[in-house]
Interface confidence: low
């Protein structure tokens, strides 16, 4: 018996087609992805093949103005239109709190939404009961397939799930649910979830009875043969893991941003054992036409976005200096504003020992592309912010050793004075440079804001300590020459859309007046 699994993950609000790098579509003839194009390909496969499941492994939320405006209603509407069979909850589904998940998505979705390792308690337990499930048994042709969901246990540090959801260890939570499916005589089981490729592989290895793992969170691109676009494969598709009980378990992911549709064919024997698995992600490029009815619907929903981008988010009563003459040479107040917004967006009161789990931000000055003039009545709009942060990136959470941070700050000024983009703006950091010293030895003082303290204060950076830092995904991926970050990071979790982070902060503050306050000094 053969099953075709179509899968997406980490779509992050890319409802419209995008450029090859998943940013805003500029040249339509070269654009990719989007739900209208996805629908065309899915329908084509559904017509051609008998047993097809369309699954999503989480993080539909967050990433473009679509989410900022529609707050998840767009996800439910278009996933319903594509007739998804199931979705696993990702960490970003909690970005607007539990209410922001329940109302627009859980209550509106016509497909099951899954997670076995999220347990509700207190008053939320009855409110959310039945709106998401640990597993779902789906009829496919003459057979049944069990889908068990899972979500990153790090979600409380990555999003805003509140205090009434407990995120358990994935493997511990999945095993009893899989065992339950076995007692129900379900012998074909897919684990669908959002914890990253390393956890996906562990699930494949450790959870008895899981036949296939469909994952997300790490934006992993797997491919067998010559890849069709710029993404470099992390391994073959499917990636095969041998379980502790000796079975070959295929593990798949489909990169991110709706650029690819994962396509996996599984052959099961009569006992539900995987006999063979093969496939590849399908690049959703312009050779696949956009479905006209879905495209028309997208255009209808788009109107509200255009109106939103010119509305006032808040006011500034000072000039927001985002000029390259400032931000690539010295502390600039636009850099301070953005870093403060980045930290504010990551406030999660971890426990009594820590006022927050992260206190530091770094931001390449070259990523700040425009100032905002306060003389326009002080008005700040989404359009203004899109000029400051035009690349459609995310502000991510990483863990780095102090020694890596020291290298990053040396790199920040290794060729100072040439208006290059690697000069770092900061938050929760005090750095002093001596430019008379040779490159690689110019950082003379580097103090960082404590997190394990009731009154935050600055302490010298410790080389062997592990620190959490918020930074643009561009830096996490080694951009602007920050190869040491890419090579030495100990953990990397993708965060929220950059403009959204800053716009939310400005809306929250209402009036802003960021200063230059001595975060970066020269001796």
């Amino acid at each position: 018996w053969e099953l075709t699994i179509l899968h997406t993950n980490d779509v992050h609000s890319r409802l419209e087609q995008t450029s090859e790098d998943s940013s805003k579509c500029v040249n339509a003839s070269r654009c990719m992805g989007g739900v209208a194009r996805l629908f065309t390909k899915v329908q084509q496969i559904r017509r051609a093949e008998p047993n097809v499941l369309l699954l999503d492994a989480g993080d539909q939320y967050q990433g473009t103005i679509w989410f900022t405006v529609y707050k998840g209603a767009e996800v439910a509407h278009f996933m319903n239109a594509l007739r998804y069979d199931a979705m696993a909850l990702g960490n970003h589904e909690f970005d607007n709190g539990v209410e922001g998940l329940i109302e627009p998505l859980l209550k509106e979705a016509k497909f099951p939404i899954l997670s076995a390792n999220i347990k509700a308690k207190g008053p939320l337990a009855s409110q959310i009961s039945g709106l998401y499930l640990p597993y779902k048994v789906l009829p496919v042709g003459d057979e049944v397939v069990g889908i068990v969901g899972y979500t990153s246990k790090e979600t409380p540090f990555l999003s805003n799930p509140g205090t009434n959801l407990v995120f358990e260890d994935e493997i511990t939570a999945l095993q009893p649910e899989v065992d339950k499916l076995k007692t129900l005589n379900v012998n074909k089981i897919i684990a669908l979830g959002h914890s990253g490729f390393e956890t996906d592989k562990l699930i494949a290895q450790k959870v008895r009875g899981v036949d296939v793992v469909v994952g997300g969170h790490s934006n992993t691109f797997l491919y067998t043969g010559n890849p069709p676009s710029k993404e470099v494969p992390a391994g073959k598709y499917p990636f095969i893991v041998t379980s502790d009980d000796g079975r070959k378990v295929p593990v798949v992911q489909a990169y991110a941003f709706g650029k690819y549709l994962g396509y996996l064919k599984i052959e099961f024997d009569e006992r539900g054992n995987v006999i063979s698995s093969h496939g590849n992600p399908i690049l959703l490029n312009s050779s696949i036409p956009e479905d006209p009815s879905i495209k028309a619907d997208i255009n209808k929903w788009r109107i509200k976005l255009d109106n939103y981008s010119t509305q006032e988010l808040g006011k500034t009563i000072v000039y927001l200096d985002g000029s390259s003459q400032s931000c690539r040479f010295r502390e600039c107040n636009m850099g301070n504003l953005i870093c403060d917004a980045m930290i504010n967006n990551n406030l999660r009161h971890a426990d009594e020992m820590f006022w927050n789990h992260v206190s530091m931000c770094i931001l390449n000055g070259g990523g700040i592309r425009s100032p905002i003039d306060e003389r326009n009545n002080g008005t700040i709009t989404w359009e203004n912010l899109a000029a400051v942060l035009p690349f459609g990136g995310t502000f991510d959470l990483v863990q780095l050793k102090g020694s890596t941070l020291k290298k990053a700050f040396e790199h920040s000024v290794h060729r100072y004075g040439q208006s290059t983009g690697e000069f770092l703006q900061v938050g929760g950091i005090h750095v002093v440079y001596d430019l008379s010293r040779k490159p690689g030895d110019r950082v003379v003082k580097l103090d960082v804001l404590c997190t394990k303290c009731r009154v935050p204060s600055y302490d010298p950076l410790k080389m062997d300590e592990i620190y959490k830092v918020i930074l643009p995904n561009f830096l996490a991926n080694g951009g602007d020459g920050f190869q040491m970050i890419k090579d030495e990071l100990l953990r990397h979790d993708s965060g929220d859309q950059d403009i959204n982070v800053v716009s939310t902060y400005i809306s929250k503050m209402k009036v802003i007046y960021p200063a230059v306050e001595g975060r970066i000094k020269f001796s």
Epitope: D244, D245, G246, R247, K248, R271
Partner: antibody
């Protein structure tokens, strides 16, 4: 072509530790697959001892769990067997082999280890 | 642990004959079974995996069959180079275990 080669002392005293090395050429042990130790006793009985995976996880035969350790040196593309508190019953030919989701397709030529005072 | 029982323990046959070796698993191992050949002083060579798939370069006179708990290795028209010891092994779950071996000798 993939080749595996065992090396180590041929004679070990009782109560001491047995240490063997498997050197792999033609394939990186961090790429994929599981890297196993198997032994064959006099009289031909075969026993799977354990493996180390491409991503540095272990799985041991429960009959040896308290005595066995399999580690690796990725820079040398080698993996190692350490068996503690040996007795004459541990006298055997020790093989390293590449397995994984498949059976053992590639084997070393084997090395005889005698445990004797 | 899953026990693998091979029979017969030894077998004498002549060149050109057909022989069958049986392997029984103490529990269901589906098709996760391999057959190996070992010549004197050499390491094992994979003949069959997944109970029935011939390994690369293995002559077509060898064939594997069975699933669940009962498996067979058949050698048609024995050749001089076929004499040695044959082992079955399951890889359904750890610990992987081997059969006790079948010694195939020249009659």
């Amino acid at each position: 072509d993939i080749q595996l080669q065992e090396s180590g002392p041929g004679l070990v005293k009782p109560s001491q530790s047995l240490s063997l090395t498997c050197s792999v050429t033609g394939y990186s042990i961090t790429s994929r697959y599981y890297w196993n130790w198997i032994r064959q006793f006099p009289g031909n009985k075969l026993e799977w001892m354990g493996y180390i995976t491409y991503d540095d996880n272990n799985n041991y035969n429960p009959s040896l769990k308290n005595r066995i350790s399999i580690t690796r040196d990725t820079s040398k593309n080698q993996f190692f067997l350490k068996l503690n508190s040996v007795t004459p019953e541990d006298t055997a030919t020790y093989y390293c082999a590449r397995g994984g989701w498949d059976p053992f397709l590639y084997w070393g030529q084997g090395t005889l280890v005698t445990v004797s005072a | 642990d899953i026990q693998m029982t091979q029979s017969p323990a030894s077998l004498s046959a002549s060149v050109g004959e057909t022989v069958t070796i049986t392997c029984r698993a103490s529990d269901n191992i589906y098709s996760y079974l391999a057959w190996y050949q070992q010549k004197q002083g050499k390491s094992l060579q994979l003949l069959v995996d997944s109970a029935k798939n011939l390994g690369e370069g293995v002559p077509s006179r060898f064939s594997g069959s069975g699933s669940g708990t009962q498996f067979y290795l058949k050698i048609n028209s024995l050749q001089p180079e076929d004499f040695g010891v044959y082992y079955c092994q399951h890889y359904y779950g750890t610990p992987f275990t081997f059969g006790g071996g079948t010694k195939l000798e020249l009659k």
